[in-house]
Amino acid sequence: SQVSQNCHNGSYEISVLMMGNSAFAEPLKNLEDAVNEGLEIVRGRLQNAGLNVTVNATFMYSDGLIHNSGDCRSSTCEGLDLLRKISNAQRMGCVLIGPSCTYSTFQMYLDTELSYPMISAGSFGLSCDYKETLTRLMSPARKLMYFLVNFWKTNDLPFKTYSWSTSYVYKNGTETEDCFWYLNALEASVSYFSHELGFKVVLRQDKEFQDILMDHNRKSNVIIMCGGPEFLYKLKGDRAVAEDIVIILVDLFNDQYFEDNVTAPDYMKNVLVLTLSPGNSLLNSSFSRNLSPTKRDFALAYLNGILLFGHMLKIFLENGENITTPKFAHAFRNLTFEGYDGPVTLDDWGDVDSTMVLLYTSVDTKKYKVLLTYDTHVNKTYPVDMSPTFTWKNSKLPNDITGRGPQ
């Protein structure tokens, strides 16, 4: 139902859903701090633009009595309950920042007449693609899929001379929320990834994964999995790995690979890590000092959500346009705004674009080195290291099918 918005007469409110069920186990206090830091920046920017207005955030907490799993499994109804709470209190802001779980975002979008924009730090699943008033500030599964297909097809780089058309995907059901939806998208039979590959099998048991590592009859040399090095080691242990196996480890929201003094353990030599390029100054910023390297991106997405709202508010106010209109609700896409750590670009569907980075372990230095980067905005790969010191034969990535010659 239509809810009146606290969004006029020089006073603009942001509704922030503080849900117990979250894509990342980040203390709500840290998210509050991120929002408040964002508000300070927005107020400064609006003031500098000569706009004398008030911008505040209202934090809407769930009672946590029913929906207390802490992860995203029981988030579907929690999101709707919070919306009902907002509706009853007549406390809707100009924008809703909040649901990070795919289940809750999908359901909230489905069950409400959204005449206001929704900004999410998460909502990674394909079911949240192409939503007209939803903006996602963390890389959704679709972006990962497009990279993988692009990389599989690439065959004209000094270190990758074969196009690939096969893959195993390891997915055992214990993944984090981001990994769950990334792998879910790769598994889906109707997805772009599945459509473009000739062979794809999902490995669901640890033993299946372990057996493939030395199986002479394997159907693909490439295994995609999601998590960090510790996750891989827990699974792989000290087992030998066939020399033409390539493990693609998707670990997008982990800045540790770029930190000082990091050395790759031996078991990472057959692994290419896909992660996001870290922000220019985020590793050392005051904002991120109390956050673990894997949680920075989540809190940063909340902060950038506030800055995005400030950006849109400024544009509309300067143009003398009304904020409580469908035009405003649909405007949070196809733009670049000044985020906390540099420009942030949103695509035509309101999804954040980013630079993905593929890392390899140098056999010489035991350091993670950048092999290539991929710009999700233009769907293009840019090689960085033209003569990588790989573990693979001739310092080239092997064919995806053993024994198959050049294509």
Epitope: Y233, D238, T263
Partner: nanobody, 115 residues
Framework: QVQLVESGGGWVHPGGSLRLSCAAS????????VDWYRQAPGKQRELVAG???????SYADAVKGRFTISTDNVKDTVYLQMNSVTPEDTAVYYC?????????WGQGTQVTVSS
Amino acid sequence: QVQLVESGGGWVHPGGSLRLSCAASRNIFSMYRVDWYRQAPGKQRELVAGITSGGTTSYADAVKGRFTISTDNVKDTVYLQMNSVTPEDTAVYYCHAHDHWRDSWGQGTQVTVSS
């Protein structure tokens, strides 16, 4: 990063035994591997023995059959049992750990084999 403290070094007769200990400030089971290195005067530091959290052990050829590396996960300590020592085993012995991300080193403990 993890802090490592070695102990147990000292003076020992050829053919004798010694047990070195490496106490870690963090759960060693969360480490990828813990190793013992040694450095004799005027020589390069060399790997003596290592153990992964998966339980795989490895030894330098010079110490195989004489030295044994083991862990006590309750005490977060790694041991190097040195048997049948020779003067060539005289060196400063260093504990090294890799926690999946970074290398950490102890200060070292001196072992002298002499009659």
